[in-house]
């Protein structure tokens, strides 16, 4: 069955970054318009994005009410100035979108360096821990938190004055490497979750940080350079 | 390991009622919609019906829509379906079965067997 | 209702046989088929979702293939235990299954 001169949605594509997740699809609409609903294998349906004339429908407030559970949406089109009748049975013509589990799907996004210290030989770097839109409480959660163990960060680092790169890796957002001294260093980062065996396993490399600019403080030469 | 266990068929006379019951153990019920699926005697499968986790949408095929009602209690991981108005062509094997999405069955009972006949 | 139509309705093989069964839906479910067996007396097993996901636990001799309107399932070689009826379903809109396929030794 379907509604007169309403074509199916297609291409249900998830877009989903550090949990931030929207359901995309075609065509563009003429004379039609979309509602999404969205539901885990539970089957208790929830419709989004009422009669809208987008190919997109933010479904990040769902998804985020447990992020390890698989989800599935479908797409309904409608004719354009559809007003709900109860007395309607015809069903419309609908498409449902592949699977999604967030915890295992979403991409991880571009890390930030958020400082480096230097004392001695030693530099620290610390990795911004980015917010999600996960709760627990009322409360919003990082991607630490969230990922737990599971999260994974690896430094690139190597001297301004080379280009042979060097790699540490960490479970927390903070490393402690070797340098030499008077040497200025770059860095680099990358988040991973080594579970996974997808190409989402890994975030794109963080801007590069050097020793020398403003990102981080060096006790060794007296420059102090305190992040935002 | 996931089991459904279905109960309650037997023989009725046509124009009368039967509740069938299903029990489930193994997993979350309440995280799965849940169906009930027969099978007539040296026939093939026939959808009957089908229930959300929550039991706050219900699906039924038009052969038995207005005669039958599927329901569950989660709080004892049971799913219901009250058949009223029998006819000798509900004859059948009845198989619950797990639903994800309601869209497929990934696991079924054993079936129990409902007779309509005076 | 979408109605969907299997074939052959009975198939005779041997062990080590490929065998295919094929499924046709009067309008286009994409992917949205399941294929199962069913033994006498049985209850049906899942072996097949989303036209060509193989369940957990079956074995990889089973594929499914197809989308829009066309599917098949394959055995790549018919053991002993792969007599029985085997039955599509479409959940595209509802449910609907397909009248079987009985396969059975020749």
């Known amino acids: 069955s379907g509604t007169t001169n309403t074509v199916a949605a297609y291409n249900l594509t998830w877009k989903s970054t550090n949990f931030k997740t929207i359901l995309e699809w075609e065509p563009k609409p003429i004379n039609q318009v979309y509602t999404v609903q969205i539901s885990t294998k539970s089957g208790d349906w929830k419709s989004k994005c009422f009669y809208t004339a987008d190919t997109e429908c933010d479904l990040t407030d769902e998804i985020v009410k447990d992020v390890k559970q698989t989800y599935l949406a479908r797409v309904f089109s409608y004719p354009a100035g559809h007003v709900e009748s109860t007395g309607s049975t015809e069903e419309p013509p609908y498409e449902n979108s592949p699977e999604f589990t967030p915890y295992l799907e979403t991409n991880l996004g571009q890390p930030t360096i958020q400082s480096f210290e230097q004392v001695g030989t030693k530099v620290n770097v610390t990795v911004q821990d980015e917010w999600t839109l996960v709760r627990r409480n009322d409360t919003f959660l990082s991607l630490r938190d969230v990922f737990g163990k599971d999260l994974i960060y690896t430094l690139y680092y190597w001297k301004s004055s080379s280009s042979g790169k060097k790699t540490a890796k960490t479970n927390t957002n903070e490393f402690l490497i070797d340098v030499d001294k008077g040497e200025n260093y770059c860095f680099s980062v990358q988040a991973v979750i080594p579970s996974r065996r997808t190409a989402n396993r890994k975030s794109t490399d963080s801007p590069v940080e050097c020793m020398g600019h403003e990102k981080g403080e060096s006790r060794e030469t007296g420059h102090h350079h305190h992040h935002h | 390991e996931v089991q459904l266990l279905e109960s309650g068929g037997g023989l009725v006379q046509p124009g009368g009622s039967l509740r069938l019951s299903c029990a489930a153990s193994g997993f979350t019920f309440s995280s799965y919609a849940m169906a009930w699926v027969r099978q007539a005697p040296g026939k093939g499968l026939e959808w009957v019906s089908a229930?959300?986790?929550?039991?706050?949408?219900?699906y039924y095929a038009d052969s038995v829509k207005g005669r039958f009602t599927i329901s569950r209690d989660n709080s004892k991981n049971t799913l219901y379906l009250q058949m009223n108005s029998l006819r000798a062509e509900d004859t059948a094997v009845y198989y619950c079965?797990?639903?994800?999405?309601?869209?497929?069955?990934?696991?079924w009972g054993k079936g129990t067997t409902v007779t309509v006949s005076s | 209702d979408i109605q969907m139509t299997q074939s052959p309705s009975t198939l005779s093989a041997s062990v080590g046989d490929r065998v295919t069964i094929t499924c046709r839906a009067s309008q286009s479910i994409s992917s949205w088929l399941a294929w199962y067996q069913q033994k006498p007396g049985k209850a049906p097993k899942l072996l097949i979702y989303?036209?060509?996901s193989l369940e957990s636990g079956v074995p990889s001799r089973f594929s499914g293939s197809g989308s829009g309107t066309e599917f098949t399932l394959t055995i790549s070689s018919l053991q002993p235990d792969d007599f029985a009826t085997y039955y599509c379903?479409?959940?595209?809109?509802?449910?609907?299954f397909g009248g079987g396929t009985k396969v059975e030794i020749k």
């Open positions: 989303k036209a060509s």
């Open positions: 229930i959300s986790g929550s039991g706050g949408l219900t």
């Open positions: 379903q479409q959940y595209k809109s509802y449910i609907t």
């Open positions: 079965a797990k639903a994800p999405y309601g869209y497929y069955m990934d696991v």
